[in-house]
């Protein structure tokens, strides 16, 4: 990752994608250390920005405005050279977000996938963006960029992610840009959590008082395992919501979560998954499906779950 013999390496922390008003640290790594350095912004000329100021270790830039978007380079201090400075570093593009209306982000076939599968993340907008960028939360590398395609009054781009491994699980957002200001990105799409299943042993799922209940009777689904899962996730077939609960250690050395569904009104097929706090978007194999049947007078659906939806929030820790 480091630059060549006389070429420093310029990087940004926490990310090259910075919201308007946010801050970003630019680090110029030169000759196995952070020495004094100068920064250049490649706008109209290669003159040092910030009035030729010299920085040590890192420069915290912000609060950023759209004018900060662009390509940066640095030169490291080299006292015994002719100029006193190294060759220019690699180019580093800083992108500033929040400059256009947010696009939409969808996952095909869905956000819950088995290890080894491929998912298409489709970013689209009627703003007709020329380029779309896909960024995973917590990653400092540049986002993936694709040229949009126009279809039926919207522009869209399909990002192919896979084969899926635990490192690719996480929270994704996409952005759009237009030619006038290609590094001034839109507001972020709503976050989309990509969850990878099938990595650990499946938990077991049971129903109390049983899988067949009278209409109006209270039902609780219990998910348990010998594995020390921190969180259990309960999903119902055909529903975009998942519920999650912290696992509780039991006296029989299992780890269990009890999901109260309330008074039974409608049947359904349920599955549960376990996950660990350190990797909240990497889940176990699915439990065997559990069909809950309601006898009597079923109405349209269960009460709305009070837990977070699976659309976002899965990949954040449960506090």
């Amino acid at each position: 990752l480091m630059g060549g013999q006389d070429k420093p390496f310029l990087s940004a922390r926490p990310s090259t994608v910075v919201p308007r008003g946010g801050h970003v640290a630019l680090q110029c790594h030169y000759r196995r250390g952070f020495n004094n350095f100068m920064l250049y912004k490649e706008d109209r000329s290669h003159v040092p920005i910030f009035h030729g100021r010299i920085f040590q270790e890192s420069f915290i830039m912000g609060p950023v405005t759209p004018a900060h978007a662009g390509t940066y380079r640095c030169r490291g201090s080299r006292p015994h050279s002719l100029t006193g400075w190294s060759a220019p570093s690699n180019p580093l593009v800083i992108m500033v977000t929040g400059n256009h209306r947010k696009p939409s982000l969808l996952a095909h076939p869905g956000p819950l996938l088995k290890s080894g599968e491929t998912v298409i993340l489709q970013c689209w907008s009627d703003v007709m963006f020329e380029h779309f960028f896909l960024h995973r939360e917590g990653i400092s590398e540049d986002p993936s960029r694709l040229v949009g395609q126009i279809h039926d009054g919207v522009s869209k781009a399909n990002f192919s992610i896979g084969p899926l491994m635990p490192v690719l699980a996480g929270t994704y957002r996409c952005y759009g840009s237009v030619p006038h200001s290609p590094y001034q990105l839109s507001a972020p799409s709503d976050p989309l959590d990509i969850v990878i299943t099938g990595l650990y042993e499946k938990p077991s799922l049971s129903a109390q008082p049983g899988p067949t209940v009278q209409a109006g009777e209270n039902v609780t689904l219990s998910c348990s395992s010998w594995s020390s899962y921190d969180i259990y996730h309960l999903s119902r077939e055909g529903e975009a919501h998942e519920r999650r609960l912290r696992a509780v250690p039991k006296v029989n050395r299992t780890f269990q979560a009890d999901f109260p569904l309330g008074p039974a009104t409608h049947g359904g097929t349920y599955r549960c998954f376990g996950s660990f706090r350190a990797l909240p978007c990497v889940w176990s194999n699915s439990s065997d499906p559990l069909l809950v049947s309601v006898t009597g007078n079923p109405s349209s659906s269960w009460p709305s779950p009070t837990e977070p939806s699976s659309k976002s929030g899965i990949c954040r820790h449960l506090h």
Epitope: P66, R101, D126, E130, G148, S155, V178, P179
Partner: antibody, heavy 119, light 112 residues
Framework: QIQLVQSGPELKKPGETVKISCKAS????????MNWVKQAPGKGLKWMGW????????TYADDFKGRFAFSLETSASTAYLQINNLKNEDMATYFC????????????WGQGTTLTVSS | DVLMTQTPLSLPVSLGDQASFSCRSS???????????LEWYLQKPGQSPSLLIY???NRFSGVPDRFSGSGSGTDFTLKITRVEAEDLGVYYC?????????FGSGTKLEIK
Amino acid sequence: QIQLVQSGPELKKPGETVKISCKASGYTFTNFGMNWVKQAPGKGLKWMGWINTYTGEPTYADDFKGRFAFSLETSASTAYLQINNLKNEDMATYFCARNGNFGYYFDYWGQGTTLTVSS
Amino acid sequence: DVLMTQTPLSLPVSLGDQASFSCRSSQNIVHSNGNTYLEWYLQKPGQSPSLLIYKVSNRFSGVPDRFSGSGSGTDFTLKITRVEAEDLGVYYCFQGSHVPFTFGSGTKLEIK
């Protein structure tokens, strides 16, 4: 259909102020930025700058910093160009032109507003 | 600023002939994102300009395939294979890669 309709011709004296409007219709106004382009009599086109209709942020070319101001009335889908302290060299036709977000710059243009500056 | 130089100033042609417009930029106009934002506009007498070609060689919607754009770096060309009466007017090249964006001085297409 998409249209940009500009206000009518203006006759002003040096030192006065003019405000030219550009009313957009047929699309979501805040989805596409708006540019202003100057054309002096018998001359070519000169890009003055643009305004981001989503954030309201203007960008001015160096020659148009100071006396020139871009503004918006988003609820009326209208962009404005105001020129203060008018000078003889401001006499020109001014066009508004929509940002073509998808790889091009000006996909729809207003019909132009002719500004005459004369004492 | 990037200076866009267009030649010739005036281009007399006969209807049905080919017309070729040249545009040269004072510096490379490849944007750091890899795109070359070079466009061609036609301004017919008494009208607003209209977009013909974007990103060097892409025809804008509704533009006849008689129009084509080519070039790279600093040298660009617009060609009309068979000139029709409706093509008359002033042709401007434009660069949108470096702020401030700049137009060429224009080439007037007229009938011989």
